[in-house]
Interface confidence: low
């Protein structure tokens, strides 16, 4: 889940309506209960007759899916509404980067140990805005209104819980989930911020105010300078409201425009591979603002040559996914200041 | 902290309409669907009826057909049950509870309807 | 419709003993691995509460002296040692098929 190990995540937005991996019963590896076929069932209101053109992913399958802008991905469980006839499904690999899982938090001492607040109107990136401001490196949201502050120190001494146990709505937020009673959702702060220095091998940047919409007016900077002599970048989520907000990527060096992408021009859906070592991406938002906005992984590449069977910035063959064997959550050089 | 908040207390007489209310916070409202209980004075629990949230259908148990009407506001978070014609056998504790996998997990506090001319 | 049968209609029992209410469907609650049987606790004045669910489940934050058992046609629940603050009236309840329905109740005082 962390910020710095992307490949290990198929889920790029926060309730997990880019899901779109194949785990077709309600728990992890054969457990939980399966799922009915989206194109088998007759009685219920999502179907693959009711996404004809699949933006929800659904088709002649039983993934696990979220098509209805539900808190995490779910499926059908039986033919009619009565009893239990949906469920929500447990994907360990469907959480954003970012996010570094449920933590129980038994409050003496706190799971994470620095300033806490409480808000009727909390969502995640409240919290993280609220953290981020206080300096801290980690934000928890619990129970669906609190918010604390704390250090990966914390997280040392940490108990992870099971996922699900953070379950409770976000009281800003109908599609978010901020936690649970006694669990904490721990995120790493740089998650949606303004501005970044990223050093780190292979990342992801989100777009500010990420998972919640991009708000009016944003005018944010992130330096990307990984080891390398080029740079691939990967768009897994790209939502602008309009052609007025805009994501522009520049040669760090000499400043020169290199791609420029907005709401009526998105990226291209696979690989953008950049023969630059360091990149600036500016995004500005004019005064309506308001979208999902955007978030994309980075990873620094050794060869600068670009492929020559291709035109840059087309598709091309993803990467293996990145080894997430030595993720772990001690400090990593490299990491973001908080913004 | 999950909450079912009811309308007060109702006094009506015969023949009057009424709507009362439940209003959701604390969850995903839409997620979980509503139903309605009926507890007459000193007798069990009766179930009268539930809507399917996202459609807004309402099912009805057969004894509440054609007496009740359940409906939804998702915008306010808020189930309705309704009478257009009270009559004094509908004096009772009216309940809502929100359905899960756990069975009727959330219950609201009851609003009580005294019908009497 | 299925009709819940429960019994005993009124239970006595001492502080520290144990108690148990049975309550039978008039057909299959079971499918597919589950029990669709729920029990509740009410108390005078107040909504009922959720204290077992699927048959056996124990509802959080409900103390385990509480315990249901059971599939198919007929089902218990048992408190194992009766404690004061357990005095109530006890509803089984079934969410196999609609209409949902309720056992008629169980009331537990002490002896």
């Known amino acids: 889940g962390s910020l710095h190990s992307p490949g290990l995540s198929e889920c790029f937005q926060v309730n997990g309506a880019d899901y779109r991996g194949h785990q077709n019963r309600t728990g992890p590896r054969g457990a939980g209960r399966p799922c009915l076929f989206w194109d088998q069932t007759q009685q219920h209101s999502y179907s693959s007759a009711s996404d004809p053109h699949g933006r929800w992913g659904l088709g002649a399958h039983n993934f696990c899916r979220n098509p209805d802008g539900d808190v995490q991905p779910w499926c059908y469980v039986a033919e009619t509404e009565e009893g239990i006839y949906w469920r929500y499904c447990d994907i360990p690999s469907c959480h954003m980067p970012g996010y570094l899982g449920c933590f129980v938090d038994s409050g003496a001492p706190p799971a994470l140990s620095g300033p806490s607040g409480t808000s009727t109107k909390l969502t995640v990136q409240v919290c993280l805005r609220f953290c981020r401001m206080k300096g801290y490196q980690l934000a928890g949201v619990e129970a669906g209104y609190a918010c604390f502050c704390g250090s990966e120190s914390d997280l040392a001494r940490g108990r992870l819980a099971p996922a699900t146990d953070c379950d409770q709505i976000c009281f800003g937020h109908p599609g978010q989930l901020c936690g649970g009673d006694g669990r904490l959702g721990v995120y790493e702060v740089s998650v949606g911020s303004c501005q970044g220095n990223w050093t780190a091998p292979q990342g992801v940047i989100y777009s500010p105010d990420f998972p919640d919409e991009y708000g009016p007016d944003r005018n944010c900077s992130w330096a990307l300078g990984p080891p390398g002599a080029a740079l691939e970048l990967t768009f897994r989520l790209f939502e602008l409201a309009d052609p007025r907000d805009r994501l522009e990527l520049r040669d760090a060096a000499s400043g020169s425009l290199l791609r420029a992408f907005d709401g009526a021009r998105p990226p291209p859906s696979g690989p953008l591979r950049l023969g630059t070592a360091a990149l600036l991406l500016t995004f500005r938002s004019d005064a309506r603002g308001h979208a999902q906005g955007f978030a994309l992984t980075y990873r620094g590449l050794q060869d600068a040559a670009e492929d020559p069977e291709a035109p840059e910035g087309s598709a091309q063959t993803p990467a293996a996914p990145l080894d997430g064997a030595n993720v772990s959550c001690s400090p990593r050089p490299g990491a973001p200041p908080a913004a | 902290e999950v909450q079912l908040v009811q309308s007060g207390a109702e006094v009506k007489k015969p023949g009057e309409s009424l709507k009362i209310s439940c209003k959701g916070s604390g969850y995903s409202f839409t997620s979980y669907p509503m139903h309605w209980v009926r507890q007459m004075p000193g007798k069990g629990l009766e179930w009268m009826g539930w809507?399917?949230?996202?459609?807004?259908?309402?099912t009805y148990a057969d004894d509440f057909k054609g007496q009740v009407t359940i409906s939804l506001d998702k915008s306010i978070s808020t189930a309705y049950l309704q009478w257009s014609s009270l009559k004094a056998s509908d004096t009772a504790m009216y309940y809502c509870a929100r359905n899960w996998d756990k069975g009727f997990d959330y219950w609201g506090q009851g609003t009580t309807v005294t019908v009497s001319s | 419709d299925i009709v819940m049968t429960q019994s005993p209609d009124s239970l006595a029992v001492s502080l520290g003993e144990r108690a148990t209410i049975n309550c039978r469907a008039s057909k299959s609650v079971s499918t597919s691995g589950y029990s669709y049987m729920h029990w509740y606790q009410q108390k005078p004045g107040q909504p009922p509460k959720l204290l077992i669910y699927?048959?056996?489940n124990l509802e959080s934050g409900v103390p385990d002296r509480f315990s249901g058992s059971g599939s198919g046609t007929d089902f218990t629940l048992t408190i194992s040692s009766l404690q004061a603050e357990d005095v109530a009236v006890y509803y089984c309840q079934h969410i196999r098929e609609l209409p949902y329905t309720f056992g008629g109740g169980t009331k537990v005082e002490i002896k």
């Open positions: 699927l048959a056996s």
């Open positions: 809507i399917k949230m996202y459609s807004g259908v309402p």
